[in-house]
Interface confidence: low
């Protein structure tokens, strides 16, 4: 899908005459009919297979055409098509004299034609205008033309549909060839997959938007690379989630049993020797002359 654009620039009819050579009275009130069709080696009558458009009266005899004054307030003239651009075309531009206000073909005398030009050839899709000038015995027409793709169509022949989007179904803009270009922070075939925070653990972390790192159950930390021990784990760590591997000096199911009571609490008095003997259990060996559980007597 695309648009053939024709920009009329200047029409010269110095003598103010029709194609028949008869002068216009009082001057040639000129409007144009444009016919765009498939390529023909010899441009011949027949339907305008790619489209047709007419302008209002643009001037009398010789005049320049402003950028906005044709086609009901549009110059360039627009000839839209909804098929793959074939790369070749035929173009017919007719200049007509309008004796009155009715510009319909059936309302004009057949000899109201001022001039008719026909060109054909190859034309690639692109932003650049091709400038052309056609001169006959009595008139001269200067114009330029191009083919561009319609909004959301791309590629050499405007056949690739691509609509930029930034929603649940994709986050991308369209390249000139119609391929997707992901917005920053997104990846995947249709740019639906967010790129997580750099370093976010591949298995233990995920994200629903770019530069995020959400931890799966059992993992924590900025990069989701720290496991979470089970809830009751007091003095322990883990290598996989919900474990509780006790720190040195701690034991029991929840690592809450002090295996180094002597060091942590120094219960033995008067220079006695302390020996750890299990969970919350210790034995004091008293120096001569002392007694009691903690050699306090």
């Amino acid at each position: 899908s695309g648009v053939f654009q024709l920009q009329l620039q200047e029409f010269i009819n110095e003598r103010g005459v029709l194609a028949s050579g008869r002068p216009c009275e009082p001057g040639c009130r000129t409007f144009f009919r444009v016919c765009l069709k498939h390529f023909q080696a010899v441009v011949s009558p027949g339907p305008c297979t790619f489209g047709t458009v007419s302008t209002p009266v643009l001037g009398t005899n010789s005049f320049a055409v402003r950028d906005d004054s044709s086609g009901g307030g549009r110059n360039p003239l627009q000839l839209p098509f909804n098929f793959t651009w074939p790369g070749t075309f035929s173009l017919i531009i007719e200049a007509w004299h309008a004796p009155g206000d009715d510009l319909r073909p059936e309302a004009l005398p057949p000899d109201a034609l001022i001039s008719k030009i026909a060109i054909q050839g190859s034309l690639a899709v692109g932003q650049n205008w091709l400038l052309d000038e056609q001169t006959s015995t009595l008139t001269r027409l200067r114009y330029s033309y191009r083919v561009i793709c319609s909004d959301n169509y791309y590629g050499d022949n405007c056949s690739r549909l691509c609509k930029k989007r930034n929603d649940h179904f994709g986050h991308y803009v369209c390249q000139p060839d119609g391929n997707l270009s992901c917005l920053p922070g997104w990846t995947g075939e249709y740019c639906q997959q967010p790129i997580c925070l750099s370093g976010c653990h591949e298995q233990n972390g995920y994200c629903s938007k770019p530069a995020e790192c959400l931890c799966r159950p059992g993992w924590q930390g900025r990069l989701c690379n720290e496991c979470i021990p089970h809830n009751g784990c007091r003095h322990g760590t883990c290598s996989t989630p919900w474990q509780c591997t006790c720190d040195e000096g701690w034991g029991g199911l929840f690592c809450d049993q002090d295996l180094n009571y002597c060091t942590h609490h120094s219960p033995c008095k008067n220079g006695a020797t302390c020996s750890n003997s299990g969970q919350r259990s210790y034995t004091c060996t008293c120096r001569p002359g002392y007694t009691g559980v903690d050699c306090e007597l």
């Epitope: 648009v3 319609s150 549909l161 179904f169 994709g170 075939e189 639906q192």
Partner: nanobody, 126 residues
Framework: QVQLQESGGGLVQAGGSLRLSCAAS????????MGWYRQAPGKEREFVAG???????YYADSVKGRFTISRDNAKNTVYLQMNSLKPEDTAVYYC????????????????????WGQGTQVTVSS
């Protein structure tokens, strides 16, 4: 013109299940995105689940793990399987489909039109 017809709504107890269907008539290509939205009384219409190119699915956080969206391309139908329903899931559920269409005149562009169904009521009682 595309027309959508939802079905499958109704009254269900909390913890129950429902399966919504949405049949599209008209020219719907397999590359078209389809989705379910819902609107509770006094609230704005919100996204529930969607299915895109290549059958990639998306879900609102509030329904993840409970709702499943699927699609039958041959029948031009999209489904929403709703399990473990909660009272806060009560709403009118709307099916939506995105269709590309060229716009005549003007700028000769293509519009992405969202067609909506009439909606089907889902009520979850406690």
């Amino acid at each position: 013109q595309v027309q959508l017809q939802e079905s499958g709504g109704g009254l269900v107890q909390a913890g129950g299940s429902l399966r919504l269907s949405c049949a599209a008539s008209g020219n719907i290509s397999t590359g078209t995105a389809m989705g379910w939205y819902r609107q509770a009384p006094g609230k704005e219409r919100e996204f529930v689940a969607g299915i895109a190119y290549g059958a990639t699915t998306y879900y609102a956080d509030s329904v993840k793990g409970r709702f499943t969206i699927s699609r039958d391309n041959a029948k031009n139908t999209v489904y929403l399987q709703m399990n473990s329903l909660k009272p806060e899931d009560t709403a009118v559920y709307y099916c939506a489909v995105e269709v590309s269409q060229s716009t005549p005149g003007g700028r000769y562009s293509v519009a992405y039109l969202i067609y909506w169904g009439q909606g089907t009521q889902v009520t979850v009682s406690s």
